[in-house]
C-alpha cells in the first residue's frame, strides 16, 4: 500500500485502550455470500462518547481502506477495483471469489478511548451451494 | 523524499515563550496527522502533542495541556508548537513526527529542535 | 497512562550475535506496539509497528514479535550500524508513551 500516494475521496469487538473504554462495536458477524457477488461489511461503535479519527479497514494484517474524519475515504489501489467505501463506515466488497473467505477487521481509532477492533468472518460460498442457503458458524 | 525540518528552538527564561516550525517537504502534507515528540538531555522519547490531517483532533500530553498549543498550515506546508509558561522541566530536543496513513506509529522525524529554559 | 517497561536497559554484544529486547506493557495493548532506533544525536527511526510489521526499508534481520502486554524485537544478526539505542512505544491509546530505551554497545 503506497502511503505517501493515498487516493482520498470527499468527505462483536473489543476495545484495546484506556481505563475508562466503554464502547463496544457491534458488527454483521459471521456471514456468507455469493461467488462473483457483493457483500456490505459494518460495524457500529457504540455506548461510548469517544471521537472516531479514523477507521481502518483490514483483512487479517492487509490494510483495504481507511475512512479519514477530516479526510475520507483511501482505498487501497490493489483493492480499488473491488472495494468500495460505505455505507457509512462500512465496506462493499464486489466481485467476490472463494479467496475472499477469511476474516475482517474494523480498527476504530478514538479518542481518549484508544483503539476498538471488531471482527467479521466472510464464507464466500459457490453459486449453487450459496442459493440453498448453506452457512456455518464459527464457534 | 519525506523531510521534516525544525526550527525556532533556543534559550528561554522560566514563564517566557517559544514557538517552533516544522517544514514538510517530500509528500503531501495535508493528508497525514503530525506529532510533536521530545528528549530531554540524557532520557527518553516522551509525546507531547498530535494534530490530525484537517486539525479536527487534537491531543496533549497531560504535562504540557494549557500550556502549548499545536497546529498546522496545510497552504505552508508547515506545523507549529507554541510554548508559554515554559518550566525547566520542559527543557528538551523538540522533534515533529509524521504519522503513519493507517495511524499505527510516526515513519518519519525530523532532526530535531533544542529547547533550554533557564534563568 | 500505559506504563511501557524495556529490559535490559543496556546490553553488550558482538557483531553476528542475535539479540532479543523485551517490551512490557502495564495493560494490553492489542498488538499495537512500535519499536524505534535512535543513534546518538540522531532522530529516531520506525523498525516495526502493531507489534511484528517491518517498516519499508528495513532490514529483515530486525523482526518482532507478541500481542497483550508482552512484546519481543529481535536482531537475528547484529550489524555494525546497529548499535543505538532502541525504544519501543504503544499506539493504542493516547497518551502515547514510549519505554526506557535499550543501549546496545558494543562487547
Known amino acids: 500500500y503506497p502511503y505517501d500516494v493515498p487516493d482520498y475521496a470527499g468527505g462483536g469487538g473489543s476495545g484495546g485502550g484506556g481505563s475508562m473504554m466503554t464502547g463496544t462495536i457491534e458488527t454483521t458477524g459471521n456471514i456468507s455470500a455469493e461467488k462473483g457477488g457483493s457483500i456490505i461489511l459494518q460495524c457500529h461503535l457504540s455506548s461510548t462518547t469517544a471521537q472516531v479519527t479514523q477507521v481502518n479497514w483490514e483483512q487479517q494484517d492487509q490494510l483495504l481502506a481507511i475512512c479519514n474524519a477530516d479526510l475520507g475515504w483511501a482505498i487501497s489501489p490493489s483493492f480499488k477495483d473491488r472495494v468500495a467505501p460505505g455505507p457509512g463506515l462500512g465496506l462493499t466488497l464486489q466481485s467476490l471469489t472463494v479467496n475472499d473467505t477469511g476474516e475482517y477487521f474494523c480498527i476504530y481509532h478514538t479518542y481518549p478511548d484508544g483503539t476498538y477492533t471488531g471482527r467479521i468472518f466472510l464464507e464466500v460460498l459457490e453459486s449453487s451451494v450459496a442459493e440453498h442457503g448453506a452457512r456455518f458458524q464459527i464457534p | 523524499e519525506v523531510q521534516l525540518v525544525e526550527s525556532g528552538g533556543g534559550l528561554v527564561q522560566p514563564g517566557g515563550s517559544l514557538r517552533l516550525s516544522c517544514a514538510a517537504s517530500?509528500?503531501?502534507?495535508?493528508?497525514?496527522?503530525m506529532h510533536w515528540v521530545r528528549q530531554a538531555p540524557g532520557k527518553g522519547l516522551e509525546w507531547v502533542a498530535f494534530?490530525?490531517?484537517?486539525?479536527?483532533?487534537?491531543y496533549y500530553a497531560d504535562t504540557v495541556k494549557g500550556r502549548f498549543t499545536i497546529s498546522r498550515d496545510n497552504a505552508k506546508n508547515s506545523l507549529y508548537l507554541q510554548m508559554n509558561s515554559l518550566r525547566a522541566e520542559d527543557t528538551a530536543v523538540y522533534y515533529c513526527?509524521?504519522?503513519?496513513?493507517?495511524?499505527?506509529?510516526?515513519?518519519?522525524w525530523g532532526q530535531g529542535t533544542m529547547v533550554t529554559v533557564s534563568s | 497512562d500505559i506504563q511501557m517497561t524495556q529490559s535490559p536497559s543496556s546490553l553488550s554484544a558482538s557483531v553476528g550475535d542475535r539479540v532479543t529486547i523485551t517490551c512490557r506493557a502495564s495493560?494490553?495493548?492489542?498488538?499495537?506496539l512500535a519499536w524505534y532506533q535512535q543513534k546518538p544525536g540522531k532522530a529516531p527511526k520506525l523498525l516495526i509497528y502493531?507489534?511484528?510489521t517491518l517498516q519499508s526499508g528495513v532490514p529483515s534481520r530486525f523482526s518482532g514479535s507478541g500481542s497483550g502486554t508482552d512484546f519481543t524485537l529481535t536482531i537475528s544478526s547484529l550489524q555494525p550500524e546497529d548499535f543505538a539505542t532502541y525504544y519501543c512505544?504503544?499506539?493504542?491509546?493516547?497518551?502515547?508513551?514510549f519505554g526506557g530505551g535499550t543501549k546496545v554497545e558494543i562487547k
Open positions: 494534530i490530525s490531517s484537517g486539525s479536527s483532533s487534537i
Open positions: 502493531s507489534g511484528s
Open positions: 517530500g509528500f503531501t502534507f495535508s493528508n497525514f496527522g
Open positions: 512505544q504503544q499506539h493504542n491509546e493516547y497518551p502515547w508513551t
Open positions: 513526527a509524521r504519522m503513519r496513513l493507517d495511524y499505527y506509529a510516526m515513519d518519519y
Open positions: 495493560k494490553s495493548i492489542s498488538k499495537y
